[in-house]
Amino acid sequence: FNMDTRKPRVIPGSRTAFFGYTVQQHDISGNKWLVVGAPLETNGYQKTGDVYKCPVIHGNCTKLNLGRVTLSNVSERKDNMRLGLSLATNPKDNSFLACSPLWSHECGSSYYTTGMCSRVNSNFRFSKTVAPALQRCQTYMDIVIVLDGSNSIYPWVEVQHFLINILKKFYIGPGQIQVGVVQYGEDVVHEFHLNDYRSVKDVVEAASHIEQRGGTETRTAFGIEFARSEAFQKGGRKGAKKVMIVITDGESHDSPDLEKVIQQSERDNVTRYAVAVLGYYNRRGINPETFLNEIKYIASDPDDKHFFNVTDEAALKDIVDALGDRIFSLEGTNKNETSFGLEMSQTGFSSHVVEDGVLLGAVGAYDWNGAVLKETSAGKVIPLRESYLKEFPEELKNHGAYLGYTVTSVVSSRQGRVYVAGAPRFNHTGKVILFTMHNNRSLTIHQAMRGQQIGSYFGSEITSVDIDGDGVTDVLLVGAPMYFNEGRERGKVYVYELRQNLFVYNGTLKDSHSYQNARFGSSIASVRDLNQDSYNDVVVGAPLEDNHAGAIYIFHGFRGSILKTPKQRITASELATGLQYFGCSIHGQLDLNEDGLIDLAVGALGNAVILWSRPVVQINASLHFEPS
């Protein structure tokens, strides 16, 4: 209708990076920009994804290098994290959120794909990380090894081998295990502190240089107390699980202190593993009963999990695996290991800014049934798995509904702001829920809409539209881009209109009648009034139309609803040659060229396209007869 197709601004980018997957218009003190997501962008050797800022009129795009943002205190894996897969602008302060839903971090032998987002302020500076699903690893441990180095230990090299082998089993790194070693006999010394080394390689190297310090006495209580009061303090981390491994070959010369020392360790929640080396006793034919009782007393309860004894120093190698396994069985404490909570949540798969924070879709949460998390300045709200049971029953828990594939919100005059989320795989047909979130981690689900067709991906795209700009939502549009019709993936957009408190189904938007795949409804954008009739409008993308070249459809708003027939269909081929997947993302909230008209930004594979609005001339014809 009034979108100019003759002089678009086609901004080129990398096709392999999928530059254009997401687009957002951006305003900084009157300067207009396009923010473009490229979720497969490479940074160094890693395919992290990234975000570009592109000037609207002329000039080249600049990479924001958000892929270089690192989280401290985690062993992160940024390769394939898909930064820019979702973008959400905050019109209040012109900041935006760029998400990396496949950002993952190492926890023990696993990688947890919790996802994370970067908040970027209005002048394109990174301001903070948003990662509500990020939890401490179960391997967030401070381990202090308390080594008896008294004269009776022989040969020392066997103790060293044990130390090196056990260290190789530890997941040492930021957010995971730290190791410190103290050696004792008559005195106690730090061999190295908890925070001295940050990798297995470095710790093993340091351990290989520990020499036996000797001593005629074995002051085990002193060694344990030194570890508790000093070694865990120097470089110890708040909230880390404290683990102590005591290795000794004889009764302590300070056993009357053990009661108090162990009480204090208990008070500090130090889990103690104790290894009795019986070499000295066996070499001299001494009964080790008193010694073994002492070591069992030192070990945390139950003994069968925390106490070890070996015939001699050489046999230490035989307990390496068992000791390692027992320490890491702490990972599974109070946990059903066959089930995932937020570990694979992929938070930030979708994002939406609300007044008090941001909603993040987490499709992988709760065994890929999905969830919606909220991050606010006051903290985060993570609804419990049980909160969703009303609409996502237990019997369908293994279906992978992907709730949070898309998130948005609506405003009703009665209920205020209500959140909306899509679950395109729910029971194979898809579902959309409208809900409010509570700080006690529960939800109130007000309404649910279900898809009609298996595999249609109903709810993979949702947009709310305030047609008349009165602050109350009039229409909710739900895309089912894989809707199969007439032998093709045609796609469908369902229209729901707000009647009192409920959204009522009111037909579908019409697409064109081509006989190829289209995926109409892959993207749906509520845009500000394009045709200057004072009603806000809607643009729908069909990126597979015209043999994957893509097309967009413009639908006009009218009197609290949406006209279901498109006023304009713009195909990629009209605009430029070689465009592909045009319409995969759409945004239209700003006048980009200062002509008083709202312009459109449309993403394509390797391109971002700006379409300029043209003025609409209203001609009012009137007939005047003379003489009357």
């Epitope: 056993s255 009357p256 002492e294």
Partner: antibody
Framework: EVQLVESGGGLVQPGGSLRLSCAAS????????IHWVRQAPGKGLEWVAS????????YYADSVKGRFTISADTSKNTAYLQMNSLRAEDTAVYYC?????????????WGQGTLVTVSS | DIQMTQSPSSLSASVGDRVTITCRAS??????VAWYQQKPGKAPKLLIY???SLYSGVPSRFSGSRSGTDFTLTISSLQPEDFATYYC???????????FGQGTKVEIK
């Protein structure tokens, strides 16, 4: 030769205070445990208190808890028993003794004792 | 707290007699039980440690044994210098708390 010598005993009024000393020689107090044991006239042995000199951990019998304080000065190789709020029933000969790993946690060396009399 | 009940409280014996003194612990304890000899006006002397080990310099007629919670001091052949009061003492494991028995006075018959 290991030796323990107590001093500081004497006559004191009820409610009064006294400080007993136990000077050790022939071994290092730093790596030892010292116990105080008392014996009321014509009665048996009663354990009073103990200290681990290097860790400063202390233990007390219920009868003296809150009134007596055991301490050690390793530089002087001497242990002390500060006795406050003394009562008539605290009248006894007070012995200090070494508690040793080498005798499987028995009191292997004792001092000669010092008499404390609490009377008005 | 563990109580050590010593019996008898006194006994009369003749030189050459075999004398047995028993201490019963109120609950199961470790073998950290010692026996002491005390003569009037003197400090106690260690005889037996770890229930059955003879302390250095102590004559071999003294011996100790354990049976469950019962600990026994035996003087195989009483000598004139053995007339004294004998005490058992138990050490609480892994602490410095100790308990004495009430004592057994061995007198000349």
């Amino acid at each position: 030769e290991v030796q323990l010598v107590e001093s500081g005993g004497g006559l004191v009024q009820p409610g009064g205070s006294l400080r007993l000393s136990c000077a050790a020689s022939g071994f290092n107090l730093y790596s030892s445990y010292i116990h105080w044991v008392r014996q009321a006239p014509g009665k048996g042995l009663e354990w009073v208190a103990s200290i681990s000199s290097y860790s400063s951990y202390t233990y007390y019998a219920d009868s003296v808890k809150g009134r007596f304080t055991i301490s050690a000065d390793t530089s002087k190789n001497t242990a002390y028993l500060q006795m406050n709020s003394l009562r008539a029933e605290d009248t006894a000969v007070y012995y200090c003794a070494r508690y040793s790993y080498y005798s499987a946690w028995a009191l292997d060396y004792w001092g000669q004792g010092t008499l404390v009399t609490v009377s008005s | 707290d563990i109580q050590m009940t010593q019996s008898p409280s006194s006994l009369s014996a003749s030189v050459g007699d075999r004398v047995t003194i028993t201490c019963r612990a109120s609950q199961s304890v470790s073998s950290a039980v010692a026996w002491y000899q005390q003569k009037p006006g003197k400090a106690p002397k260690l005889l037996i440690y770890s229930a059955s080990s003879l302390y250095s310099g102590v004559p071999s007629r003294f011996s100790g044994s354990r049976s469950g919670t019962d600990f026994t001091l035996t003087i195989s052949s009483l000598q004139p210098e053995d007339f004294a009061t004998y005490y058992c003492q138990q050490s609480a494991p892994y602490s410095s708390l100790i308990t004495f028995g009430q004592g057994t006075k061995v007198e000349i018959k």
